[in-house]
């Protein structure tokens, strides 16, 4: 079977600063030199793209400057960080990996990571 398997953690809790990190690991059926990683958010049956980056194997992956994601790659493993999260962003975040080059193309979709985001309590007013 030449399908591509993608593994990611089931649950992650965002930090109080609204930052969540998780590892997306894929078992490559081919020798890809160009890989695209996309983070998707699934809410109900709607799927939206959160961020995407293409990288050459052996190089760092680079998200667009205005992206809420950052990441590093090592072999078939990508460490993803999503920032600026708020409680309303709690949901299922799916790691999608595509082997873009050389042909053939392969698609891999993880089962998703449920990211829980809790907004920090506002600081109480002080008289100082």
């Amino acid at each position: 079977c030449k399908a591509m398997h993608v593994a990611q953690p089931a649950v992650v809790l965002a930090s109080s600063r609204g930052i969540a990190s998780f590892v997306c690991e894929y078992a490559s059926p081919g020798k890809a030199t160009e890989v695209r990683v996309t983070v998707l958010r699934q809410a109900d049956s709607q799927v939206t793209e959160v961020c995407a980056a293409t990288y050459m194997m052996g190089n760092e992956l680079t998200f667009l400057d205005d992206s809420i994601c950052t990441g590093t790659s090592s072999g078939n493993q990508v460490n993803l960080t999503i920032q600026g999260l708020r409680a309303m962003d709690t949901g299922l975040y799916i790691c999608k990996v595509e082997l873009m080059y050389p042909p053939p193309y392969y698609l891999g979709i993880g089962n998703g990571t449920q990211i829980y985001v809790i907004d920090p309590e506002p600081c109480p007013d002080s008289d100082f």
Epitope: C1, K2, A3, M4, H5, P29, E34, R36, T38, L40, V47, T48, E49, A52, T54, K96, E98, M100, Y101, P103, P104, Y105, Y106, L107, I109
Partner: antibody
């Protein structure tokens, strides 16, 4: 709402060329892989080619490799298929198709008929 | 290349009956990458099922998909008059993306 509208089909002689276009609207074009799928009269569906995202990566069916070129212009939200050295067996309705974020083919144009005949 | 085979080629049934369509792959296909499409004469195909079992937007719940590995099934629980059409399975996990030859569901 998502719309895909093909144009450029017609009758052409064997060995000649034709260029199909597909105007897309209602979605962020550059975030999606775009495909051409064809259907010969009375036959099933055959995937032809795909162009990904920024247009740098393309994949083709063996039956059209070296003769057809898929491309896209993200600034115009338009997909193209340049068809050279056409053969009688290329006669088909050609559909422009969006590959959704999870990979399946979720939106199809109405199709444009290409007839290769002398 | 993954070759998909569909059976039966034609299924003759009456409205209200249950339709069971089969799709078999030449090698294992992850269920995440198997779709079903419906096509009526003179129309473009329409996505019914993706990921082997998830209904596309707006698809009635009488349509359901199942299966894994090399064997997949599309079931229409009670055929409505508008369901008589040709149904194609497809794998989209690797290129070349391939379709089955189709199953025609016609009125008995």
């Amino acid at each position: 709402q998502v719309q895909l509208v093909e144009s450029g089909g017609g009758v052409v002689q064997p060995g000649r060329s034709l260029r199909l276009s597909c105007a897309a609207s209602g979605f962020t074009f550059s975030s999606y892989g775009m495909h051409w799928v064809r259907q010969a009269p009375g036959k099933g569906l055959e995937w032809v080619a795909v162009v990904w995202y920024d247009g740098n990566n393309k994949h083709y069916a063996d039956s059209v490799k070296g003769r057809f070129t898929i491309s896209r212009d993200n600034s115009k939200n338009t997909l193209y298929l340049q068809m050279n050295s056409l053969r009688a067996e290329d006669t088909a309705v050609y559909y422009c198709v969006r590959g959704d974020l999870l990979g399946s083919f979720d939106y199809w144009g109405q199709g444009t008929l290409v007839t290769v005949s002398s | 290349e993954i070759v998909l085979t569909q059976s039966p080629g034609t299924l003759s049934l009456s409205p209200g009956e249950r339709a069971t369509l089969s799709c078999r792959a030449s090698q294992s296909v992850s269920s995440s990458y198997l779709a079903w499409y419906q096509q009526k004469p003179g129309q473009a195909p329409r996505l019914l099922i993706y990921g082997a079992s998830s209904r596309a937007t707006g698809i009635p719940d009488r349509f359901s998909g199942s299966g894994s590995g090399t064997d997949f099934t599309l079931t229409i629980s009670r055929l409505e008059p508008e369901d008589f059409a040709v149904y194609y399975c497809q794998q989209y996990g690797s290129s070349p993306f391939t379709f089955g030859p189709g199953t025609k569901v016609d009125i008995k």
